[in-house]
Amino acid sequence: PGPPPGPPRVSPDPRAELDSTVLLTRSLLADTRQLAAQLRDKFPADGDHNLDSLPTLAMSAGALGALQLPGVLTRLRADLLSYLRHVQWLRRAGGSSLKTLEPELGTLQARLDRLLRRLQLLMSRLALPQPPPDPPAPPLAPPSSAWGGIRAAHAILGGLHLTLDWAVRGLLLLKTRL
């Protein structure tokens, strides 16, 4: 006879699954805040910085109340993939000024990657429909100058900070409904 059957697969507790995702998100939020503050100290920002290639912010007035778990996770995953790509780009093409933010930028990239894996796992455990594979994104053009790289860093970290706040708020709100 073959090996004895393994223990029956316990269906995951969605609240516990969400909890560990929220924990990772909050942790990444704190890292991002710290890194953004470090960037502001070294290269003070004047006003808001935007980058056209970044995802538009996920939340608008009233939208949080209507959130559903599949939509939040799918949107969050897509946005974080974009931010991961931007952080990788920043590390590669951001110029010598941004080297002063290492190894923190590398740590941020690794934690972002970990959160994305966690989201993927959560979606499969909750049997949510898996999004189709992402189409290859057009390559990001290198910054036109050292200052362009710094402005891009402000935009990327600022946008990621707000996206993670949206994620924590949305996920905790959804948890109260489970």
Epitope: D19, L23, L29, L57, M59, G62, V168
Partner: antibody, heavy 119, light 111 residues
Amino acid sequence: EVQLVQSGAEVKKPGASVKISCKASGYTFTDYNMDWVKQAPGQRLEWIGDINPHQGGPIYNQKFTGRATLTVDKSASTAYMELSSLRSEDTAVYYCARGELGHWYFDVWGQGTTVTVSS
Amino acid sequence: DIVLTQSPASLALSPGERATLSCRASKSVSTSGYSYIHWYQQKPGQAPRLLIYLASNLDSGVPARFSGSGSGTDFTLTISSLEEEDFATYYCQHSRDLPPTFGQGTKLEIK
């Protein structure tokens, strides 16, 4: 100096609505959430909800959903809380407070606005 | 919702003494190195003031005689040597889940 300055005391009749303002200064308004907290006489502090000024999305304590409405005017660095269908148990001091993104601790508070609901 | 219970309800001490205030949560508010508990001080007619965030971090401008500790469900605010201006009501608050909730407070009075 980082400051939150709230509008003055209000006396309202049951069934009416009240709208309180909270003007922020001394920091970048969109870098923090704005939270609202109720303190009724002899009761513990109660979180009403919060709003992210950058994106404008409020979330509410279920207890206040449907009666509290949180809004912001980014250009004026001002947050608002409107409470409708007032009843006597809404008599309280209402505070706005600056909330750390994603962590809900409140490091700067307004001076409070007293709302009295009485017929 | 998570319920926070503070003890004692009131405490009478003299300046120079050590004060130990307790806050117990109805379920754990800690997770992987983070404890989502915060402490505030409130004086009559004033707004609350943040003292400690995430269980043990002193907010800027708060004297070093204040400290926070604990994890899981049991947390403590300690004032190592009481000054006149420390006599007030102290609240704990959690932010582990939504909604954040507050304890009922501990009133610290002069003996």
